[in-house]
Interface confidence: medium
């Protein structure tokens, strides 16, 4: 007998992780009509693909590409330019300014003459034609053709305190999510953007050391929870006649207007009708405005019959931003997610009031995302089958049948590999690409609008599968768990060699955070698969009350109490696995960031025994010192008649006394302009004025991502050696 | 404890009609989805209608869609089965039940009551 | 409508012996799948939901497994009092209709 090779599998290293060795790639095609679309090669070459003819060329080659040191691009709808963005650079969470160049793909050379200025905090094409839209120095410009001269639309622009089609700090992180706020009508008639003015808003100011004698100060005007708000305005501008007649303000619903609110979206419905979205400052009424264009006025009217008001009566309006409505072709009539009576988001049908909206979907599961809706059908994603919340998969609904009928695209076509999809339509879904991110290994692959048919695969990610055929990855199961009468779903990573006679130590990766969700089938390989392939950790996430896509009576339970049962849900989580029998009580470690820096902490802080160690990573430590669109939005207002004695008690500084029986880690960038490095300043305060010892890690001039190569490395073998020793595992 | 009592059942000529009730205690009413099944004699189970919490959502069986209509009254924590043009094989003994507060199985049911329909 | 069809029909045991009765669903409703318990003359009781979590004070020989379409209950020494008819539930996204198998009588031999 020949003695047997053993497993020559080898099992996940830090370096793997820090190196991004196994990393996925994904496939969305730039979709440029009903069947065409562009995509930026391996060489950086931009080809062109038609689906029907199967033609493919190169667009703009790389050579193009990198004679400006390109890293994107943009083609205008008439095909005859590009513009080429370099010199990214990076401002907050979606904002960076860069510099464009106009490519003439007819006459092969870049466009010389009224050079675009530099740095541009914005530029995008109308969707017509070719004219530009840019925003340099908070003003909006505007180009007929790329060689014609600008003319500037806004003059009152001005830095840190008005801002012209793009959004200030709170507005881009907390509202919009994106870096612009102006949207081109269907025909690039009309352009619309928003004014935000943070004249009287506070400022936050934090040093930034670079290399310098003395340390830059960055300002930003943040308003905190109960602070003074940016005060919005929204305009429309007839970019034919731009001179003409100036730039139009679009009303404010009367109900919305009588006191503090905010702008939350802008939706072209037509070339000559809009809709805004509107929310109060108390985040539980959403109105939905429709305006049209008066010509004989030259004014925009919203009339208050085409308001419609949206209101919760047991949390906050929408899930984590209020959704925007997907119009049908009528130009009246829309479908749009909001909860129902039953308290989980569905789609309904709108098409006079929001009273006699005609429910589309219907159970005790939530619609997600409305991608698109055509003259007959509407494709959505929900986490319905087979009532696993952490998944996705894309529906079609029939609309022209009565009663409309559904067909899950998704549901069985990989179905151990791919739960969870997300999908980009060509124009009016003739076509459609479908990216599954797991939990198996993410694939691309395009399909036929009509029939579904699968026409081709785009990413197998094939050369991550042969790389991963000799690693012993740990094993995922999702389950759930209960309490009382309480279901808790949670994803837990088991080491490869997994035997549930032994016992593990455990470390709970928790975020937590209102409509967020931990637990989904999706593919990974990070730093925590790497803990329990390398160093024999079991990992689990929860998703515990407050998370998402569950129904509101889960989502709205944390209403202006957080900090309270998401702690007390990873608390009841940690015993149910003790239960199990395979994890040492002795060796349990909990750690979260930002959210979860803070749910961390207070677990940590707990006074349950059940941690022995956990780390914070760039956390929240009182709600009021957080922006006021988020804070507000789950805790109300910090004054007295409204609810400040829970922003006082739900703080980590309060509960510094009960940090001194359990190994605290505490890692905060000084340059954090999201949660800011203020937060654990406080708690070191607290803890080192009640005498208790913890260890600290600040990461200069790094952001709320602490992501620059150097300082993630440095984090993660930080952290790594920490746990470790805290679990007693040898280095 | 949860009890629900249901009442109305009685014997009665097919056309005709019948309103059951089920009085609910011992939990709180209006934050439950609740549910009629009834059971043929010696038969098997069959679930009739539902209805949701806000008592804006309402559901039926095939059998029974057009003729029964539930609906419930929280301020006397009352469930209802209005049942019209009755047939023979709507002969059951009907139960009240209380669903889960997520999920459509049923926690609690009560004794059942009997309707005959027979000319 | 999803159809459960339970087999078998009639089980016939002795006390102490093991008890495997079966569900299959036309089509997957994931582990959305309850089980009952019927005497005679009596309501139906709450055994088993999520087609593997025991009810509220249901003793630990009543365990249920399965998901998608193939669903057991199983009742690992049979007690006097497990003489009875058991019925499956799928509530499939909670989306009606709700329906029953046919039932599965468990008498003593």
């Known amino acids: 007998l020949r003695p047997s090779r053993g497993n020559t599998k080898r099992a996940l290293t830090l370096k793997d992780i820090l190196n991004g060795t196994f990393s996925y790639k994904t496939y969305f095609p730039n979709w440029i009509s009903e069947q065409e679309y562009l995509h930026q090669s391996e060489d950086d070459n931009i080809v062109f693909y038609n689906i029907e003819t199967r033609e493919s060329y190169i667009i703009l080659s790389n050579s193009t590409m990198k004679s400006v040191n390109a890293t994107d691009y943009g083609l205008s709808p008439d095909r005859q330019f590009v513009y080429l963005e370099s010199d990214y650079s990076k401002l907050w969470r979606y904002s960076y300014t860069a510099t464009y160049y106009i490519y003439d793909l007819q006459n092969g050379e870049f466009v010389r003459g009224y050079e675009l200025p530099r740095p541009i905090q914005y530029l995008c094409w109308s969707p017509v034609g070719s004219k530009l839209a840019y925003v340099y120095q908070n003003n909006i410009y505007l180009k007929q053709r790329p060689g014609d001269p600008p003319f500037q639309i806004t003059y009152t622009g001005r830095e840190n305190r008005i801002f012209n089609g793009i959004p200030d700090w709170v507005y881009e992180e907390e509202m919009l999510a994106t870096k612009y706020a102006l949207w081109w009508s269907p025909d690039g008639k009309f352009l619309a953007y928003v004014e935000f003015n943070d004249s009287d808003i506070p400022i936050i100011a934090y040093s930034y050391y670079g290399d310098g004698q003395y340390p830059r100060t960055i300002n930003i005007p943040y308003p905190k929870a109960g602070a003074k708000n940016p005060v919005v305005r929204v305009f429309i501008v007839d970019t034919t006649y731009p001179h003409h007649v100036g730039p139009m303000e679009v009303p404010v619903p009367e109900m919305i207007a009588s006191s503090d609110y905010y702008f939350s979206w802008l939706t072209w419905v037509s070339s000559e009708r809009v809709c805004l979205q509107w929310l109060k400052r108390v985040q539980n009424v959403s109105v939905l405005s429709i305006c049209d264009f008066r010509e004989d006025w030259h004014a925009w009217e919203c009339p208050k019959n085409q308001e419609h008001v949206e209101e919760s009566r047991t949390g906050w309006a929408g899930g984590f931003f209020v959704s925007t409505p997907a119009f049908s072709q009528d130009a009246t009539s829309y479908y749009k997610i909001f909860s129902d009576k039953d308290g989980y988001k569905h789609i309904h049908y709108i098409k006079d009031t929001v009273e006699n909206a005609i429910q589309i979907t219907s159970g005790k599961w939530e619609a997600i995302y409305i991608f698109r809706v055509t003259q007959d059908s509407l494709f959505y994603s929900s986490n319905e089958f087979e009532g696993y919340p952490g998944r996705r998969n894309i529906y079609r609904i029939s609309i022209g049948n009565s009663p409309p009928s559904k067909k899950c695209v998704t549901c069985h076509l990989r179905k151990e590999r791919c739960q969870y999809y997300t999908a980009s339509f060509s124009y009016k879904a003739k076509y459609y690409a479908l990216v599954c991110y797991g939990p198996g290994l993410p694939i691309s692959t395009l399909h036929d609008g009509r029939t579904d048919q699968e026409i081709q695969v785009l990413e197998e990610n094939k050369e991550l599968e042969n790389s991963l055929r000799n690693i012993q990855l740990p094993k995922v199961e999702i389950k759930k768990l209960k309490d009382g009468g309480l279901t808790f779903w949670y994803k837990m990573i088991l080491p490869p060699q997994f035997d549930r006679s032994k016992k593990y130590p455990l470390l709970i990766q928790v975020y937590g955070g209102p409509c967020s969700q931990s637990v989904k089938s999706v593919f990974a390989v990070n730093w925590i698969t790497y803990l329990a392939s390398k160093e024999g950790i079991v990992i689990a996430l929860v998703d515990g009350r407050g998370t998402a896509f569950q129904g509101d009576k889960f989502l709205h339970a944390v209403y202006r109490k957080l900090g309270v049962y998401e702690v007390e849900d990873q608390l009841t989580a940690v015993r149910k696995f003790i239960e199990m029998g395979f994890i040492d009580e002795e060796r349990i470690a909990i750690w979260g960031w930002s959210y979860g820096g803070y749910v961390s902490s207070l677990a940590l802080a707990s006074g349950t025994g059940l941690f022995k160690c956990g780390i914070a990573v760039a956390p929240v430590s009182s709600w009021e010192y957080y922006a006021s669109i988020y804070s507000e939005r789950f805790m109300g207002l910090p004054t007295k008649d409204d609810n400040l004695e829970h922003y006082k008690n739900s703080t980590v500084m309060a509960r510094a006394e009960y940090f001194r029986n359990v190994d605290y880690l505490l890692i905060h960038g000084t340059a954090d302009d999201n949660v800011h490095f203020q937060n654990s300043a406080q708690i070191a305060k607290a803890l080192v004025n009640a005498q208790v010892d913890f260890q600290a890690m600040w990461y200069s001039d790094q952001n709320h991502g602490i992501s620059s190569g150097r300082s993630q490395n440095h984090l993660y073998t930080h952290m790594t050696h920490f746990l470790k020793q805290c679990f007693s595992l040898s280095d | 404890d949860v009890q629900l009592v249901e009442s109305g059942g009685g014997v009665v000529r097919p056309g005709e009609s019948l309103r059951l009730s089920c009085a609910a205690s011992?939990?709180?009413?209006?934050?439950?989805?609740m549910g009629w099944v009834r059971q043929a004699p010696g038969e098997g189970l069959e679930w009739v209608s539902g209805?949701?919490?806000?008592?804006?959502?309402?559901y039926y069986a095939d059998s029974v869609k057009g003729r029964f209509t539930i609906s419930r009254d929280s301020s006397n924590n009352t469930l209802y089965l209005q049942m019209n043009s009755l047939r023979a094989e709507d002969t059951a003994l009907y139960y009240c039940?209380?669903?889960?507060?997520?999920?459509?199985?049923?926690?609690?049911w009560g004794l059942g009551t009997l309707v005959t329909v027979s000319s | 409508e999803i159809v459960l069809t339970q087999s078998p029909g009639t089980l016939s045991l002795s006390p102490g012996e093991r008890a495997t009765l079966s569900c299959r669903a036309s089509?997957?409703?994931?582990?959305?799948l309850a089980w009952y318990q019927q005497k005679p003359g009596q309501a139906p009781r709450l055994l088993i939901y999520?087609?593997?979590d025991r009810a509220t004070a249901i003793p630990d020989r009543f365990s249920g497994s399965g998901s998608g379409t193939e669903f057991t209950l199983t009742i690992s020494r049979l007690e006097p009092e497990d003489f009875a008819v058991y019925y499956c539930?799928?509530?499939?996204?909670?989306?009606?209709?709700?329906?029953f198998g046919g039932g599965t009588k468990v008498e003593i031999k």
């Open positions: 089509q997957s409703v994931g582990y959305y």
């Open positions: 011992g939990f709180t009413f209006s934050s439950y989805d």
């Open positions: 209805i949701r919490v806000s008592g804006g959502s309402t």
């Open positions: 539930q799928q509530y499939y996204n909670n989306w009606p209709p709700l329906t």
């Open positions: 999520d087609a593997s």
């Open positions: 039940a209380k669903e889960n507060d997520r999920h459509s199985f049923f926690e609690y």
